[in-house]
């Protein structure tokens, strides 16, 4: 039978001779050279050679366990003379014995990691890992221990796990953001003579909201014209915050001051500036300076840092309202005046008043916009604003006069304003009543006395307060011996009645009746109107059949009295 144990061979042999592995030996070998040893399998004849007489095996080359830790070979012992095996072919192993010839190697040459600033000591940052190619099952060649070469006192590393942790309290990103930590991994459990490898860990402190906003100055001053419309930006302020991103976002608010209602502050969403804007219309003459207290605060606050103080800051903003030369302001938005239509030229109707609202109180002159009074019916005293007539008025021509008055600053004619004046012309009884239409009627030859032949209506251009009251009568010159009578109906109408039975058209074809119409106002106005009455032939129903031809041609022609 074969006589050997497992063969062991130290790796990385550096001797000048071949490295002795061991001896194959059969108990059938008498030492007389009759047996021949043959080697086959992994590396036989190349890496491993055998003395066929003695069975001694040698390694011809330097072996690396990390490349191949085990070689499996087969041994044969044959009788040289017969060529027959004296032992069954058998497999054996050459195990390469480890030496510490490999340093630990990190999985990454450079690690990148982040950890929030102000983290508690012992906060996990990152885990680094190094591997050693040596045999972990034998000795300490592959037992890796981690240590920190660079990065203290800020960070520490757990020797066995490679976990890097924070080691210093209150590491402040605003003070230092980047750290380069060098970690060493050493085998042999870290003992002397162990091999080592290193890696770099770039650690960035990420921002937390540990800084409040701060105004770089305690007071700001801005100017804005009083004419600035609501919404107008008038200035920018900026609180600085050492934090970044969301932690540096700032909200501005007005917390106090007389300008609380007059101004607003908004945050520029891109630049994080506070923009002071006008909220309501300003008036230099009412208030020239406003003071605001503006607060800058972080909208997102981390409660654990509140012990550092409030995450807000205040500044005073002084706003100076600048005077703008404003046009004069009339005491009313519109004026309504009245005047009797019989007013004489130069009669004063009323007055307007305008004042310069500016502090300077510049004097004002008045004028009439002639585009609104082309006929120059009215005028104005340029100094005191009195309105007076410059022509006679007639209510019946125009009841309302709508004119525009202009007030202009004497020292600055560019500054002017306008106001409408509505002048009502009041009625005076200066028109006589008249017939509403031209009256031409007829009477039948066979008419009976007291027969109504026409109803009269009157009109008057005047507009008395209590309404019209007209009276009708025959003119005095026609009253006696008239063939007709006037009956006043007392309702502003009158009737013409026949006074006799029968008329002869051949004797008198046409009658002209002068009728006096009077009003009941003061002073009484009256006029005389003529009614033409033709005498016609009629049928038994009273329908006209024929009249005198002359009367048709000259309806207003004169004839003898009615």
């Amino acid at each position: 039978s074969w006589m050997w144990n497992q063969f062991f061979l130290l790796e990385e042999y550096t001797g000048s001779d071949y490295q002795y592995v061991g001896k194959l030996h059969s108990d059938q070998d008498r030492g007389d050279g009759s047996l021949k040893y043959i080697l086959s399998g992994d590396g036989a004849g190349d890496l491993f050679i055998i003395n066929e007489n003695t069975g001694d095996i040698q390694a011809t080359k330097r072996l690396d366990r990390e490349e191949k830790p085990v070689y499996i070979l087969r041994a044969q012992a044959i009788n040289r003379r017969t060529g027959r095996p004296v032992e069954p072919e058998s497999e054996f192993i050459i195990k390469i014995h480890d030496i510490n010839d490999n340093e630990p190697i990190f999985t990454k040459e450079v690690y990148t990691a982040t950890v929030p600033e102000m983290s508690d000591v012992g906060t996990f940052v990152v885990q680094v890992t190094a591997t050693d190619a040596d045999d972990p099952t034998y000795g300490n060649s592959a037992k890796v221990v981690y240590s920190i070469l660079q990065g203290q006192p800020y960070f520490s590393v757990e020797s066995e796990t490679g976990i890097i942790k924070t080691a210093l309290l209150n590491m402040d990103r605003e003070n230092r953001e980047q750290y380069q930590v060098v970690i060493q991994a050493k085998d042999m459990g870290g003992q002397m003579g162990g091999l080592s490898g290193t890696t770099t860990v770039n650690i960035t402190l990420t921002d937390v909201n540990d800084n409040p906003p701060r105004f770089p100055q305690s007071t700001y001053q801005f100017k804005t014209p009083e004419s600035s419309p609501p919404g107008t930006p008038i200035g920018r302020i900026k609180a600085s915050d050492a934090d970044v991103g969301e932690n540096a976002e700032i909200e501005y608010s007005i917390t106090d001051g007389e300008g609380l209602d007059m101004f607003d502050v908004i945050t520029d969403q891109e630049t994080q500036e506070g923009i002071i804007t006008v909220k309501k219309l300003l008036d230099f003459e009412k208030k020239k300076v406003y003071t605001l207290k503006v607060e800058a605060s972080n909208p997102y606050v981390e409660p654990r840092f509140l012990y550092l103080g409030p995450f807000k800051d205040s500044a005073t903003v002084r706003i100076v309202v600048e005077d703008v030369d404003e046009p004069p302001v009339f005491s009313k938005l519109a004026y309504i005046l009245q005047i009797r239509e019989d007013a004489q030229i130069n009669t004063t109707i009323g007055s307007v008043t305008a004042q310069d609202p500016d502090a300077a109180r510049n004097p004002v002159k008045y004028s009439v916009d002639r585009h609104t009074d082309m006929d120059r019916i009215f005028n104005i005293d340029s100094g005191n604003g009195s309105i007076f007539t410059s022509k006679l008025l007639d209510r019946e021509t125009l009841l309302w006069h709508n004119i525009t008055v202009i007030a202009t600053e004497i020292n600055n004619p560019k500054q002017s304003s306008r106001v409408p004046l509505y002048i009502k012309v009041l009625d005076v009884n200066d028109n006589a009543p008249e017939f509403a239409e031209f009256y031409e009627t007829f009477v039948c030859e066979k008419a009976k006395a007291d027969q109504l032949i026409q109803t009269l209506h009157a009109v008057d251009k005047d507009d008395p307060y209590s309404g019209h009251q007209f009276s009708f009568s025959l003119a005095p010159e026609a009253a006696s011996g008239s063939n007709f009578t006037i009956q006043d109906n007392k309702d502003n109408t009158a009737g013409i009645l026949t006074r006799k039975n029968g008329y002869n058209r051949h004797e008198m074809s046409t009658y002209l009746l002068p009728v006096v119409i009077s009003d009941n106002d003061y002073p009484v106005q009256s006029s005389t109107g003529t009614v033409t009455v033709r005498v016609c032939a009629c049928d038994h129903h009273g329908n006209m059949q024929s009249c005198h031809a002359e009367a048709l041609i000259h309806p207003t022609g004169l004839s003898t009295g009615a």
Epitope: P230, G231, P233, I266, T267, D268, Q269, E270, T271, I275
Partner: antibody, heavy 121, light 107 residues
Framework: EVQLVESGGGLVQPGGSLRLSCAAS????????MNWVRQAPGKGLEWVGR??????????YYADSVTDRFTISRDDSKNSLYLQMNSLKTEDTAVYYC????????????WGQGTLVTVSS | DIQLTQSPSSLSASVGDRVTITCSAS???????LHWYQQKPGKSPKLLIY???YLASGVPLRFSGSGSGTDFTLTISSLQPEDFATYYC????????FGQGTKLEIK
């Protein structure tokens, strides 16, 4: 006077790409976020996306309908805004407006004249 | 995302009428973040009222805005012929959103 002039619109097939440009003038371009807004024919207004200023790392935001297909960029040295449109769909047919916000970067105060993009086969 | 719902969607009115358009937000927003726009056919939208109350430059005083939280209003006190257009509300929180629009037409 604030001026925004869009260009680059035209007819493109579904699946195709187009790049719109917007030339800005009359204001400090670097202090304003910029937006693209579109309007399909006969329809309402739809926000496409926004790009912030350098201080905010040129962060971009997009409407869900264009995310992963459209990219907004800006070149502050050229006062220019861009919209790269890829994988175009027929529903992307619209007039595209380049829009600047009001002071403080609120609202959409200044609009270009718009450029028409037609996606059709 | 914050949804904005305008009402009415369309409105017929006459010159001189007082008109009110409302904008309702699906969740509360600061008045700083709500704005109104006017758009006429074939034209770019125009900022009308910013930060809920403030009139943009050149906008007539007949326009006004109000509201807070989730309910905002645009009012035109006396309609003029040039006011017939489509009006949109918009909020500033990313993703920015617009109301669906209110078309104001001549009665």
């Amino acid at each position: 006077e604030v001026q925004l002039v869009e260009s680059g619109g035209g007819l493109v097939q579904p699946g195709g790409s187009l790049r719109l440009s917007c030339a800005a003038s009359g204001f400090t371009f670097t202090t304003y976020a910029m937006n693209w807004v579109r309007q399909a024919p006969g329809k309402g207004l739809e926000w496409v996306g926004r790009i912030r200023i350098k201080n905010n790392n040129y962060a971009t935001y997009y409407a869900d309908s264009v995310t992963d297909r459209f990219t907004i960029s800006r070149d502050d040295s050229k006062n220019s805004l861009y919209l790269q449109m890829n994988s175009l769909k027929t529903e992307d047919t619209a007039v595209y407006y380049c829009v600047r916000p009001d002071y403080g970067n609120y609202g959409l105060a200044y609009w270009g004249q718009g450029t028409l993009v037609t996606v059709s086969s | 995302d914050i949804q904005l719902t305008q009402s009415p969607s369309s409105l017929s009115a006459s010159v001189g009428d007082r008109v009110t358009i409302t904008c309702s937000a699906s969740s509360s927003i600061s008045s700083h973040y709500l704005h109104w726009y006017q758009q006429k056919p074939g034209k770019s939208p125009k900022l009308l009222i910013y930060r809920s109350f403030y009139l943009a430059s050149g906008v007539p005083l007949r326009f006004s805005g109000s509201g807070s939280g989730t309910d905002f209003t645009l009012t035109i006190s006396s309609l003029q012929p040039e006011d017939f257009a489509t009006y949109y509300c918009q909020q500033d929180i990313v993703p920015l959103t617009f109301g669906q629009g209110t078309k104001l037409e001549i009665k």
